[in-house]
Interface confidence: medium
Amino acid sequence: CKAMHVAQPAVVLASSRGIASFVCEYASPGKATEVRVTVLRQADSQVTEVCAATYMMGNELTFLDDSICTGTSSGNQVNLTIQGLRAMDTGLYICKVELMYPPPYYLGIGNGTQIYVIDPEPCPDSDF
């Protein structure tokens, strides 16, 4: 297994609708044709998988239908969007990239993007 550098932004603030987007960029030493991208969430020393997609270079990422993630790829960059986030989802979101085929297999793990989610204040009742 060979190591690969993965870069991602340090901090991202989710929108008021609970949507956060960030770019995950990897330094590909070879020309991979099949790439797997996994988003991991680290909170309180617990790491859980948020979503994952395997895609062909030049093609769109395809996440499972019920996934909270969507994404597009362009060269060695993956634009990831996570939706449906609540304040309790605030945490470190780590991008893991695997160059699956052809060999050699490369694995890269980013330092993580701290996503801050602030639940919107409920609108006050208005009397008419």
Epitope: E34, M56, Y101
Partner: antibody, heavy 119, light 110 residues
């Protein structure tokens, strides 16, 4: 124990069709990169086709449009559907498993099945 | 005609060292893809000898070694033995999303 067993070869007339099977045991065909490689009598190895873990398929120019690679995950079997066969398709056909998710390169071959295209 | 070229034959006396070259292009070997080497005895399936340019699977003697530089790779066999007489193939990958094999080299032990 990993095992790949090809079957379905035989004598077929030009223009005919044949389906080769490669029954796998000891691993899952859906979790590996599965190839068909052929070797004409007295000649070298020639790559035919591959099916990726994600299901994408690719073919050598010499068989494109005539051959179709597929897999049945429930039967853990790889297939090669060969149509419009030509005399130059005569060869021993091997299935080859390669790749590895942990970075350890995996490479296993079947014993091969002979396809003879002749009138 | 293979896009990856090997010499059709090489020979050497027992105990000698022989090398087999595998020359490709910038779209395969030179693109950063791994090269593998196989040994094939008559009537048998190919056996992996070297993977990832220079790694030996368990059970393969250290007399066999591989290297890669630029658009070519090579297999070296030291201390040649009679049982090394076989056909040898290199395998690479191509940016056209295909697997490519060299044309094969017949090794004769004199």
């Amino acid at each position: 124990q990993v095992q790949l067993v090809e079957s379905g070869g035989g004598l077929i007339q030009p223009g005919g069709s044949l389906r080769l099977s490669c029954a796998a045991s000891g691993f899952s065909v859906s979790n590996n990169y599965m190839n068909w490689v052929r070797q004409a009598p007295g000649k070298g190895l020639e790559w035919v086709s591959v099916i990726y873990r994600g299901g994408s398929t690719y073919y050598a120019d010499s068989v494109k449009g005539r051959f179709t690679i597929s897999r049945d995950n429930s039967k853990n079997t790889l297939y090669l559907q060969m149509n419009s066969l030509r005399t130059e398709d005569t060869a021993v056909y091997y299935c080859l498993r390669e790749g590895g998710t942990s970075g350890d390169y995996v490479n296993d071959w079947g014993q091969g099945t002979l396809v003879t295209v002749s009138s | 005609q293979s896009v990856v070229t090997q010499p059709p034959s090489v020979s050497g006396a027992p105990g000698q060292r022989v090398t087999i070259s595998c020359t490709g292009s910038s779209s395969n070997i030179g693109a950063g893809y791994d090269v593998h080497w196989y040994q094939q005895l008559p009537g048998t399936a190919p056996k992996l000898l070297i993977y990832g340019n220079k790694n030996r699977p368990s059970g393969v003697p250290d007399r066999f070694s591989g290297s890669k530089s630029g658009t070519s790779a090579s297999l070296a066999i030291t201390g040649l033995q009679a049982e090394d007489e076989a056909d040898y193939y290199c395998q690479a990958y191509d940016s056209s999303l295909s697997v490519v094999f060299g044309g094969g080299t017949k090794l004769t032990v004199l």
